[in-house]
Interface confidence: low
């Protein structure tokens, strides 16, 4: 008698190991002889494909080389005529050992900066993910972690971390090792001692010393006044990533000594710095035989650049030193007509109270020179063009007269303001800070050769210049 | 190793006079400009004078010019305030302290250095 | 003269905290600003300079900030010799002057 199908044993979930073969058995009871199919997640698995094997009139479905992607639920359907079709379901769990999909690869990185080692991986049940450094198991901490991907993330790397790492993947059906991989630490250059200020009598001999660390260890060099170390002799000596510089130094002027200390980082440089100023013993102090007495400008020229009811030091080595001392501030603001707009204010105010010094009344009537930090910043910022070629004219004897020599500072014979806060005067209206600075252009190719301090913003000034120069 | 020792503290009567001494070593004291500082019993922080290395500057508070006097003797290593006209609001612990330049030369480094103070008690 | 004025007077801490201590000047005093530690019964220690410049040899978790009239002392993580009074100074023009002080004291 006809008999609709009935599924006699049902299809229970299978696990497999990858490689292996998996089978499922779809016992059916009917007649006529049913015909038997099979899906894989609802696509149908043709009989011809290769990969298969579907045998006892299709009762038999056998997989014969399981592959991760063969995951999924199987179903067999029955079906003779008789009746409905009948189906019956089960999984395919493909169980697999672990597998290294992303080993870590060696890596460089710089100290404080994050740090992460690849270690992606694949295996069912789904691996747990360890770390080896060097011999040992590596501990997590809170700046170690292992992700969820595998992946080893180390925060502010230090110096410590440096060394051989492996991740380890596991699961119940085995263990999986990546090769080991090095973690290179690198540190940015540091000056550990740097070299110190002296103040010294003419023609001593000084010894600066710099010492440095890194990794790689960095090298040294010494700038004088910003250009490289012309005279001195240097000896170096590296121990155990230390770098020890010693720069010894016959002394005739005074001058900054800056040693600096770089190392590279793939295409990068770091670099640290450290100053030291040599000063030579009585070299700036002002002179105590000064002539002349305190009395407020009267004259024309500089009106607007002196502060008002201002004490000037009028010389008295002049016949007349009101007038002379004008006629020295005519003849070179005369010179000043063909200069930049930025330098011309800049240059007025240096030479208004360079030659009509403030002057500090008492008993012996002192001229307070210009600070050096505002001569400088005309020197080398406001004016650096015009201050070149007005230098190289002064060297071949190209000006008219020899006043004209009188009427510019040499920056470098100036008191700090910082030495003493009455030991230098202030230019009022030369207001200009570093910040504004970054924001324009070079205008020339030369830098500073010296690091220009910040000075003080006036509250009294009449203008403000922003030069057009980088300080980068 | 820089060493400011003060000395010379003490009581004196309100009207009365005081002379402090600083005795330092340990570095070049002719190169240097020192300071006092003092503080009252249980206050703050008070700059008292100021002398530059070779006395060409000296600086006082307010409150004492005309009555105090700041003086150094270089080959002595030594610096001194010559108290005069002491008044109970003098009372306190009287600091010698050292000052520099940082490395750059430009700029100021106020008070670096410390003596352990004197006591100056001011009382009738 | 330029008035110094800190704030707080006392401020109550833990070991590990991060602690804040403000200046103000009555004027600009660009950036000549010092800041002491003192403890009871010893000199005072000079920890910055020039605002935001540290004296050698004191830790690093020390640092300074600020310009013009509105000036910090921040300690970043507190630790048990930490706890003692730090005063402001001004150093920008005679007569130079130091704020009130401010005690740090464990909580």
């Known amino acids: 008698l006809p008999k609709a199908p009935v599924i006699t044993t049902p299809l229970e979930t299978v696990d497999a190991l990858v490689e292996e073969v998996a089978t499922f058995m779809c016992a059916v009871e009917s007649y006529p002889q049913p015909e038997i199919s099979w899906t894989r997640n609802k696509i149908l698995i043709k009989l011809f494909d290769t990969r298969y094997s579907i045998r006892e009139n299709g009762q038999l479905l056998t997989i014969l080389s399981v592959e991760d992607s063969d995951d999924g639920i199987y179903c067999c359907t029955a079906n003779n005529g008789v009746g409905g079709a009948v189906e019956s379901c089960g999984a395919l769990q493909v169980k697999m050992k672990p597998k290294i999909t992303r080993p870590p690869i060696n890596v460089k990185i710089i100290e404080g900066l994050k740090a992460v080692l690849p270690c992606t991986t694949m295996g069912n049940p789904k691996p747990s993910v360890s770390w080896i450094k060097g011999d040992s198991p590596l501990r997590e901490n809170s700046r170690i972690a292992v992700l969820e991907s595998g992946s080893l993330r180390i925060h502010n790397v230090q110096k410590e971390d440096a060394g051989q790492y492996r991740c380890v993947a596991k699961n119940s059906l085995g263990t999986a090792y990546s090769k080991v991989v090095k973690l290179e630490v690198e540190v940015f250059a540091r000056i550990l001692r740097a070299p110190e200020s002296h103040n010294v009598t003419f023609g001593s001999f000084v010894t600066l010393h710099c010492t440095a660390t890194g990794i790689p260890v960095p090298t040294i060099t010494w700038i004088e006044n910003g250009n490289a170390v012309s005279s001195g002799s240097i000896q170096e000596s590296v121990k155990d990533r230390v770098i020890d510089s010693r720069l010894q130094l016959f002394i005739t002027k005074p001058g900054l000594y800056t040693c600096i200390a770089t190392n590279k980082h793939g295409e990068k440089f770091s670099t640290a710095k450290a100053a030291a100023t040599i000063s030579i013993a009585e070299w700036s102090k002002p002179q105590k035989d000064n002539k002349g007495y305190c009395a407020q400008y009267r004259g024309e020229v500089c009106n607007a650049v002196l502060a008002k009811d201002a004490l000037v030091f009028l010389n008295t080595s002049y016949a007349d030193p009101e007038e002379a001392q004008e006629l020295l501030v005519h003849t070179a603001w005369n010179e000043l007509k063909v200069v930049s707009p930025v330098c011309r204010p800049a240059a007025e105010a240096l030479l208004c109270n360079h030659i009509f010094q403030e002057c500090s009344p008492g008993v012996v009537p002192t001229p307070i020179p210009i600070c050096r930090e505002y001569c400088l910043a005309v020197k080398e910022l406001f004016c650096a063009k015009e201050w070149l070629v007005m230098e190289e004219k002064t060297h071949r004897g190209l000006y008219r007269s020899e006043m004209h020599l009188l009427s510019v500072p040499e920056c470098s014979k100036l008191p700090s303001m910082h030495w003493d806060p009455t030991a230098c005067a202030r230019l009022p209206h030369l207001d200009y800070n570093k910040e504004n600075l970054k924001t324009f252009p070079p205008m020339t190719s030369s830098k500073p050769s010296v690091d220009i301090p910040n000075l003080p913003s006036s509250s009294s000034s009449s203008f403000s210049v922003s030069p057009t120069y980088s300080m980068t | 190793e820089v060493q400011l020792v003060e000395s010379g503290g003490g009581l004196v009567k309100p009207g009365g006079s005081l002379r402090l001494s600083c005795a330092a070593s340990g570095f070049t004291f002719s190169s240097y400009s020192m300071n006092w500082v003092r503080q009252a019993p249980g206050k703050g922080l008070e700059w008292v004078s100021s002398?530059?290395?070779?006395?060409?500057?000296?600086y006082y508070t307010d409150s004492v010019k005309g009555r105090f006097t700041i003086s150094r003797d270089n080959a002595k290593n030594s610096l001194y305030l010559q108290m005069n006209s002491l008044s109970a609001e003098d009372t306190a612990v009287y600091y010698c302290a050292r000052d520099r330049y940082d490395r750059s030369g430009y700029y100021y480094v106020p008070f670096d250095q410390w003596g352990q103070g004197t006591l100056v008690t001011v009382s009738s | 003269d330029i008035q110094m004025t800190q704030s707080p007077s006392t401020l109550s801490a833990s070991v590990g905290d991060r602690v804040t201590i403000t200046c103000r000047a009555s004027q600009s005093i660009t950036s000549w600003l010092a800041w002491y530690q003192q403890k009871p019964g010893k000199a005072p220690k000079l920890l910055i300079y020039k605002a935001s410049s540290l004296e050698s040899g004191v830790p690093s978790r020390f640092s300074g900030s600020g310009s013009g009239t509105e000036f910090t002392l921040t300690i970043s993580s507190l630790q048990p010799d930490d706890f003692a009074t730090y005063y402001c100074q001004q150093y920008n023009s005679f007569s130079w002057t130091f704020g009130q002080g401010t005690k740090v004291e464990i909580k």
């Open positions: 002398i530059s290395s070779s006395s060409s500057y000296i």
